[in-house]
């Protein structure tokens, strides 16, 4: 199970939004807590360590998940075009 | 409606590898895990592996020295090869799509199945 | 591997009834469990998945519960199509198990 907890939110910039959050979760040997479906989940520890972002599907049913580079986070594609990038740190 | 198809030769000679592919169609390759599923007669289901999007696997214990699934997204497919067949490998081989209901991952979508004899 | 057993492993009953199937897990699974139904000559269809919900399209005769070790499946007021193969599988490690399946019949 896990619950999100919002950092802080800075929406001074026009049309774009940045928030930082991170999730509280009770997982199993082996897991850790990340992203599936744009909700936060327990995903292979693997998928972590490797920073293959995409395989958590942190994405959206019908978004397209792409790396960013260096595999610094993931972006999600809308069908209409629109673009939401998420950063790990 | 996402439809799976499994595709590949019905019959595989003993020590051969044994090799199918999936075509997803009615929906991107990229947003599921996929699964191969195996069943032999009059038997009950047997789970193979999973592919990733980005191409990881995970494997059954009991096959993974001789099982490799691999997926071409610019195909819409992923693929099974099974080396070193005997017969029995012989069974219906499924492909499947694995979705994530929040944390529970299930097998929601199924090809018709495919069967393969391993015989001389 | 985590071992799933399912009981009985045939069952006769008849249109109207209500069935319930077992399944247990060799070690807590949480509600990671799916059940799946198959009629001969057909790919399995999910049934139910985390233990208890009901997968979209599904009527809601059917029922699921249990969790940690012990799960059930119930059938209220058995129709024809129900009358097949169920199978549960655990969906909390690797490999993934399923259960030896339950044979329902016409009684």
């Known amino acids: 199970t896990c619950e999100i907890v919002t950092l802080d939110r800075d929406s001074s910039q026009p049309r774009r939004t940045i928030a930082r959050q991170t999730a509280r979760c009770a997982c199993r040997k082996g897991q850790i807590a990340g992203t599936t479906r744009a909700r936060p989940a327990c995903v292979d520890a693997r998928i972590i360590k490797t920073k293959q972002w995409c395989d958590m599907l942190p994405c959206l049913e019908g978004e397209g998940c792409d790396l960013l580079i260096n595999r610094s986070g993931w972006t999600c594609t809308q069908p209409g075009g629109r673009i939401k990038t998420t950063t790990v740190s | 409606q996402v439809q799976l198809q499994e595709s590949g030769p019905g019959l595989v000679k003993p020590s051969e590898t044994l090799s199918l592919t999936c075509t997803v169609s009615g929906g991107s390759i990229s947003s599921y895990y996929w699964s191969w599923i195996r069943q032999p007669p009059g038997k009950g289901l047997e789970w193979i592996g999973y592919i990733y999007p980005s191409g990881s696997t995970n494997y059954n214990p009991s096959l993974k020295s001789r099982v490799t699934i691999s997926v071409d997204t610019s195909k819409n497919q992923f693929s099974l090869n099974l080396k070193s067949v005997t017969a029995v490998d012989t069974a219906v081989y499924y492909c499947?799509?694995?979705?994530?209901?929040?944390?529970?991952?299930?097998?929601?979508?199924w090809g018709q199945g495919t069967t393969v004899t391993v015989s001389s | 591997d985590i071992q799933m057993t399912q009981s009985p492993s045939s069952l006769s009953a008849s249109v109207g009834d209500r069935i319930t199937i077992s399944c247990r897990a060799s070690q807590s699974i949480s509600t990671s469990l799916n059940w799946y139904q198959q009629t001969p000559g057909k790919a399995p269809r999910l049934l139910i998945y985390g233990a208890s919900t009901l997968q979209s399209g599904v009527p809601s005769r059917f029922s699921g519960g249990g969790s940690g070790t012990d799960f059930s499946l119930t059938i209220t007021s058995l129709q024809p199509e129900d009358f097949a193969t169920y199978y549960c599988?655990?969906?909390?490690?690797?490999?993934?198990?399923f259960g030896q399946g339950t044979k329902l019949d016409i009684k």
């Open positions: 599988q655990e969906s909390a490690s690797i490999p993934r198990t």
């Open positions: 499947a799509r694995v979705n994530p209901f929040g944390y529970y991952y299930a097998m929601d979508v």
